[in-house]
């Protein structure tokens, strides 16, 4: 993986738990930039510092989640620490991954997207609507919308509200869903791919 | 400071193929999805393809689609548009742009690169 | 796929005037619209996304607004560097697609 993700897994890593504690508290109340959203309270504070890492460069990507990671550091007294993470992270310029690609799902675009085409069944099917949100959340859900459906009792009424917002979706951010579906239940997209 | 350098101009006979490269600096290739527009010469923009962060995503115009080949090297920092049966329609600037997320708006373009497309 | 038409095609406004150009989609498109410049000899470059979200760095005499299928650029006082070609994009869905131009030239 990138230098500034691996500086933030070594700096995570060489704190106590109570430490990681009060990291992932101050990370709930820290400024963030315009633009960036908060990770979900409930699935902070169950991480450990290899999934924090994860979130954090998936929300936030290696720059500024380097960067945030320092500050929260900072905040916390670590000046020392978050000045190493600081130095690690400038030393190289945080080289992407190779990436293995998988081969293109999508090369010629249908009438409808594949979420829209299996909304019914989607409802109906999904169980992992907790992982989906967490996917989501940030990139293509508000605080508020993803409040709203894990507020819902059941699964399809989860999927049910999380369909309620696809409306206002263009089509990279249907991809995001999809892209989320095939993590999380791929055995299900392949199933409703042959269908 | 993001930076997109496209490479690969040339003239080729029609039929003919040709590879575009676009070397990306200052940000991490691997998060964005990135797109090839081009622009002919009566000024007139058109999207040409279209590839996701991981490279699981790919769209064509129709016109261009079993002919041009989108792809991107994660590793390397590159995105590449691979061109055979070429036509004298193909003839434009090829510009590689960045798309940022979620919803992937064209937030930087490159210089451009010229193809040529003549007999 | 969704059609957008530009209008005008080209115009010139005094140095001061404020000008509005237009681009109307053949379909709802939410507010996946962007508007572009492109000065001569140069790349285009991104004023405004989302509609009417104004990219850092770009002046705020540009303004972007509309919804559905109607949108329009607005520049509230032009500058003799405004010059140039302004294009719109929707991004709503594939294949994207731009408005055909408008050339904008000094008075």
């Known amino acids: 993986m990138g230098r500034a993700r691996d500086a933030i897994l070594d700096a995570l890593e060489n704190l106590t738990a109570e430490e990681l504690k009060k990291f992932k508290l101050k990370l709930l109340s820290v400024p963030l930039r315009e633009g960036y959203g908060r990770i979900p309270r409930g699935a902070l504070l169950s991480m450990d510092a290899l999934d924090l890492t994860d979130k954090l460069v998936s929300f936030y990507l290696e720059t500024y989640g380097a960067e945030l990671t320092a500050n929260v550091l900072r905040d916390m007294g670590l000046q020392e620490m978050a000045g190493q993470l600081q130095a690690a992270t400038h030393q190289g310029s945080g080289a992407a991954p190779a990436g293995i690609q998988a081969p293109p799902q999508s090369a010629a675009k249908p009438g409808l997207h594949f979420i829209d085409q299996h909304r019914a069944a989607l409802i109906a099917r999904v169980t992992n609507v907790e992982w989906l949100l967490d996917a989501l959340y940030g990139k293509v859900l508000t605080d508020e919308q993803y409040q709203a459906v894990r507020a819902e009792p059941t699964n399809p009424s989860k999927m049910r509200k999380l369909f309620s917002f696809t409306p206002a979706w263009n089509w990279t951010c249907k991809d995001l869903l999809l892209q989320a579906l095939r993590e999380s239940q791929s055995y299900l997209v392949e199933d409703l791919e042959r269908s | 400071d993001v930076k997109l350098v496209e490479s690969g101009e040339g003239l080729v006979k029609p039929g003919g193929s040709l590879k575009l490269s676009c070397a990306v600096s200052g940000f991490t290739f691997s998060n964005y999805a990135m797109s090839w527009v081009r622009q002919t010469p009566e000024k007139r923009l058109e999207w040409v393809a279209y590839?996701?962060?991981?490279?699981?995503?790919?769209y064509y115009r129709d016109t261009v689609k079993g002919r041009f080949t989108i792809s991107r090297d994660n590793a390397r920092n590159t995105l590449y548009l691979q061109m055979s049966s070429l036509k004298s329609e193909d003839t434009a600037m090829y510009y590689c742009i960045l798309q940022l997320r979620p919803e992937a708006w064209f937030a930087y373009w490159g210089q451009g690169t010229l193809v040529t497309v003549s007999a | 796929d969704i059609k957008m038409t530009q209008s005008p095609s080209s115009m010139y406004a005094s140095l001061g005037e404020r000008v509005t150009i237009t681009c109307k989609a053949s379909q709802d498109i939410k507010n996946y619209l962007s508007w572009f410049q492109q000065i001569p000899g140069k790349s285009p470059k991104t004023l405004i996304y989302?509609?009417?979200r104004l990219v850092d760095g770009v002046p705020s005499r540009f303004s972007g607004s509309g919804s559905g299928q109607d949108y329009s650029l607005t520049i509230s006082s032009l500058e003799y560097e405004d010059m140039g070609i302004y294009y719109c994009l929707q991004y709503y869905e594939f294949p994207y697609t731009f408005g055909g131009g408008t050339k904008l030239e000094i008075k």
């Open positions: 989302r509609a009417n």
């Open positions: 590839i996701s962060s991981g490279g699981d995503f790919i």
